[in-house]
């Protein structure tokens, strides 16, 4: 029997390598049964997760799952770090695993990864 609890499908220890200056969408896949929960994003600062208030977010609905998306337009160097999404469901707070963004600053060509490094790095298939 499928659980009717809200479930947030971010993998533990997941990582994304992205380029500063590019647009990027960070997805929080959300499974729920009836009413869509209120979902927020926060960014980890040590052990506390600071809520991201004035950031562009959107929902994308698919057949069996919904995605709460945090938009980076564009990615900035200080977007580097770990993020977590949280859902309020029946007065319970459900937290996802954190996912880490590694931002490469394209201004410094010497910091750009080589082709070999790129092959072994988590470049997104977006």
């Amino acid at each position: 029997k499928e659980s009717c609890d809200v479930q947030l499908y971010i993998k533990r220890q997941s990582e994304h390598s992205i380029l500063a200056g590019d647009p990027f969408e960070l997805e929080c896949p959300v499974k729920y049964c009836a009413n869509r929960p209120h979902v927020t994003w926060c960014k980890l600062n040590g052990t506390t997760c600071v809520k991201l208030e004035d950031r562009q977010t959107s929902w994308k609905e698919e057949k069996n799952i919904s995605f709460f998306i945090l938009h980076f337009e564009p990615v900035l160097p200080n977007d580097n770090g770990s993020y977590r999404c949280s859902a309020n469901f029946q007065s319970n707070l459900i937290e996802s695993h954190s996912t880490t963004l590694y931002v490469t600053d394209v201004k410094s060509a010497s910091e750009r990864p080589s082709k070999d490094e790129m092959a072994s790095r988590p470049w997104l298939l977006y």
Epitope: K11, H97, L125
Partner: antibody, heavy 119, light 112 residues
Framework: EVQLVESGGGLVQPGRSLRLSCTTS????????IHWFRQAPGKGLEWVGR????????KYTASFKGRATISADGSKSIAYLQMNSLKTEDTAVYYC????????????WGQGTLVTVSS | DIVMTQSPDSLAVSLGERATINCKSS???????????LNWLQQKPGQSPKRLIY???KLDSGVPDRFSGSGSGTDFTLTISSLQAEDLAVYYC?????????FGQGTKLEIK
Amino acid sequence: EVQLVESGGGLVQPGRSLRLSCTTSGFNIKDTYIHWFRQAPGKGLEWVGRNDPANGNTKYTASFKGRATISADGSKSIAYLQMNSLKTEDTAVYYCASYEGYYERFGYWGQGTLVTVSS
Amino acid sequence: DIVMTQSPDSLAVSLGERATINCKSSQSLLDRDGKTYLNWLQQKPGQSPKRLIYLVSKLDSGVPDRFSGSGSGTDFTLTISSLQAEDLAVYYCWQDTHFPYTFGQGTKLEIK
């Protein structure tokens, strides 16, 4: 039925390369991390590294970095371990395993494939 | 790297008796999400390993309830409450809190 089947093992000469495959079925590979482990004859288990088939991210044990490449084809539900510059001490049974990435709900192992490095 | 040390290296226990295997890590396995990613594997002779226990104490589906796991921080225990003949195996603890993931050296469980 869940299955992980490793293939590609066998006898290989020192200095050569080998690509092992791990064919999976019965679950969505993109919901998991694919790990490769190895076990030398009569010895314990060693983690080689892991791949996230959803985005290609890989992690390795330091001793395998630069010599091993783990990849996955999510559309075919197959993962790979490419090992270069093989040495006699790489002789081992190599296992792939698939661990659910969100809630640890399962951890499946393949039956293993024996790689023998010898001249 | 985190060093995982199991004790004893081998253990002989009579059928129906309790078997206890210990695992100690060189640093805490408590992750920042508040969970502890310590697993126990069973490897029977000539077979591939099988996950028995994850998150210290959660039994994998189909694992008999005579198996249990406990512990926190750096000290963990696998207990078999009443040893059965089919429990003859090597048992490994492994941690996937910190990269690189590491294993204990294994404990060989034999029937006395």
